[in-house]
Interface confidence: low
């Protein structure tokens, strides 16, 4: 534990005096005291000297020396009084904030211990303290108002008798903040309610608080309902419960129900909506387009939202063709309940194969009947291209067939040299075929188109390329004649390279 010199608990000096406080410890030491002017600090290893050669009343206070490295946290203290005949009080703070029932320390420090007998606490402008104000005084620390109340939030002054007259400190504002837990906690069950006319229903509104002084009511639209209140106390909380029992609901029972609870802190409310329907209902919908296009090999999740009352008695996904009689695997279908009356059903279709294109239907059943929602899934394919040489009406013709989905566009290129694919530098001519002939176009299948390029003479050191593209990708086929004058020979005498 550090040691302070002079080794007295209190030191009394006059204004203007020189004061030297020395602290010695095993390791480095630190001083802590009221913020006041004129102090000089010298530190030298395990000792620290706090000194002033012009003490003022503002230096009055307790100075504590601590040894930061000491695991036991030992400290020593000395209280300094600078007894100024004109200044009996040193006020360390002009605003003090506490919560109700805490002790509030008003830090007016007496500058002369001799004056202790004549001290008192008053409100500003000499007004007496409020009734039941319980306080004590310490010359080292000031006045403490015990278990402060909100009403004691006032401006105070410390008073001392000097030569038969009362001398006041500057004022200290005390703010006592109320500790109120807040509005009561509420529950309203259920959060949403649907019933068919004639069925029974129950709505429960409950509120709880640590304080018994609160009100709770259940409101239907703007009408406050008169419901007998059930009260309880458990888990250190008061609970008040209102239970609305409707044996046979009718349309006038529908609407907004608000559970409202209030106390001195304010009000909380929570609401629910009660829907009364004529008969069972079952509505299927999807945020997705019912016509889906996906690239082959990719995945797709089909989602259906179901709104139903009463609850579902059955549901399933079905594949309606046209490619095979396979059915979706149950493990790829899942259901999630959003709330009591709304559910989401998802069918996962990973890595789609050509045979999985077609119609998928979600079917659901409740007492209101069956409902179905059908998705049409078309797969997208990049074009596949082939070219053959043939004669049409006596003219030599290159015939290009392209198959893909969406329908491919066709472009012909003629380029110099023999190549698998024409590049820009080699291109001699380009023909776009804006209207290739559609050979086949069936739902859920690829579209096959055919484009004809009439060529009077096939140039021998050249390549003819048919390119097809769509939104998925592109494909091409290069046709290379291998001898001059080939146009006079039938197609099978020519080499063509895919």
């Amino acid at each position: 534990i550090p040691v302070i010199e002079p080794s007295v608990p209190e030191l009394v000096v006059k204004p203007g005096a020189t004061v030297t406080l020395r602290c010695v410890g095993n390791g480095s030491v630190e001083w802590d005291g009221p913020p006041s002017p004129h102090w000089t600090l010298y530190s030298d290893g395990s000792s620290s000297i706090l000194s002033t050669n012009n003490a003022t009343f503002q230096n009055t206070g307790t100075y504590r020396c601590t040894e930061p490295g000491d695991p036991l946290g030992g400290s020593a203290a000395i209280h300094l009084y600078v007894k100024d005949p004109a200044r009996p009080w040193n006020v360390l703070a002009q605003e003090v904030v506490v919560f109700e029932d805490q002790d509030a320390l008003l830090p007016c420090l007496l500058t002369d211990p001799v004056l202790e007998a004549g001290v008192s606490l008053v409100r500003v402008r000499g007004r007496p303290l409020m009734r039941h104000t319980n306080y004590s005084f310490s010359p080292w620390h000031g006045f403490t108002i015990h278990r402060a109340k909100f009403i004691q939030s006032q401006d105070y002054q410390c008073s001392a008798l000097m030569g038969g007259r009362k001398v006041m400190s500057i004022s200290i504002r005390l703010k006592v903040q109320k500790v109120i837990p807040g509005p009561p906690a509420l529950t309203l069950v259920p959060a949403e309610l649907v019933r068919i006319r004639g069925e029974a229903a129950q709505i429960v509104c409950s509120a709880s608080s640590v304080d018994v002084n609160f009100d709770v009511f259940l409101q239907h639209n703007n009408t406050k309902l008169a419901i007998p209140q059930q009260s309880d106390f458990h888990n250190n909380r008061y609970q008040k419960v209102l239970t609305l029992n409707l044996d046979q609901v009718d349309f006038q029972h529908a609407g907004n129900y608000s559970c409202v609870a209030s106390n001195v802190q304010g009000k909380h409310s929570t609401s629910m909506f009660f829907r009364v329907v004529e008969s069972a209902y079952l509505n299927l919908s999807s945020e997705q387009n019912l016509i889906q296009e996906v690239t082959v090999g990719e995945g797709l999740n089909l989602k259906v939202m179901v709104e139903a009352y009463p609850g579902l008695q059955g549901f399933n996904w079905t594949y309606l063709g046209p490619f095979s009689d396979h059915q979706p695997e149950p493990k790829l279908a899942n259901a999630t309940t959003k709330d009591t009356y709304r559910h989401t059903f998802t069918l996962s279709l990973p890595r789609l194969k050509p045979s999985e294109a077609g119609r998928y239907s979600f079917l659901a059943r409740n007492p209101g009947g069956w409902r179905a929602l059908t998705f049409e899934l078309t797969l997208r394919y990049p074009p596949e291209v082939s070219v053959i040489w043939t004669f049409i009406n006596g003219s030599g013709t290159l015939l290009c067939a392209a198959s893909g989905y969406p329908q491919p566009n066709v472009t012909w290129l003629q380029c110099s040299g023999h190549t698998d694919r024409c590049d820009e530098a080699q291109v001699l001519q380009v023909w776009d075929d804006p209207y290739p002939e559609v050979l086949s176009q069936e739902p859920f299948h690829k579209v096959t188109v055919q484009s004809l390029l009439t060529v009077e003479t096939l140039e021998h050191n050249q390549t003819y390329e048919c390119r097809a593209h769509n939104s998925v990708g592109s494909g091409s086929w290069a046709f290379i004649p291998i001898s001059a004058g080939a146009h006079t020979h039938p197609p099978d005498e020519f080499l063509f390279t895919p």
């Epitope: 909100f150 009403i151 703010k175 903040q177 807040g182 304010g266």
Partner: antibody
Amino acid sequence: QVQLVQSGPEVKKPGASVKVSCKASGYTFTGYYMHWVRQAPGQGLEWMGWINPISGGTNYAQKFQGRVTMTRDTSISTAYMELSRLRSDDTAVYYCARQDNWNYFDYWGQGTLVTVSS
Amino acid sequence: DIVMTQTPLSLPVTPGEPASISCRSSQSLLDSDDGNTYLDWFLQKPGQSPQLLIYTLSYRASGVPDRFSGSGSGTDFTLKISRVEADDVGVYYCMQRIEFPFTFGQGTKLEIK
């Protein structure tokens, strides 16, 4: 120093909604209730409600129940007042006001003029 | 809701003269629990936000000159200005906050003669 800075003027059509913000600085935002008060042109002051910034709890004047929503974002020390289904008689200057721990309104925002006109 | 009624609605005053504004509530603003009377006075100067003058019946807000004072009890309250200055012009409002909704008086416009 304590400051409440409100968002700029708004012009809205009847039936629309408006959301006014009030950014607090210079004090602990969650330590004080924030109230909203409005003043129609040439008229007096009208209390709308309060929000407890620490819990988000609110208390609205009955007149505005169902149309007013008071929210806050403690991360940016900002309170919001949203009024929906606006009518021409909602044309007013809307003020936020801090409630001191002694309950009185010690600081007010500069006001936001909301004009509702077709 | 508690109704607050102010009189007069307009108050022309000569600088240096005293002024008095009355406010009446439809029910008592005295809180029996803590003994406080929850009535406040505000001044709204032209083109400005309201500013607090007096809170909890008689406490002057920070920075308010001691020319302003509040008094009253129960349901009848008075704001007094001992010597009116040119800077005091504006609309004065009383407000109750003993219960929700807080309500204001209709305002008293103080003008300089």
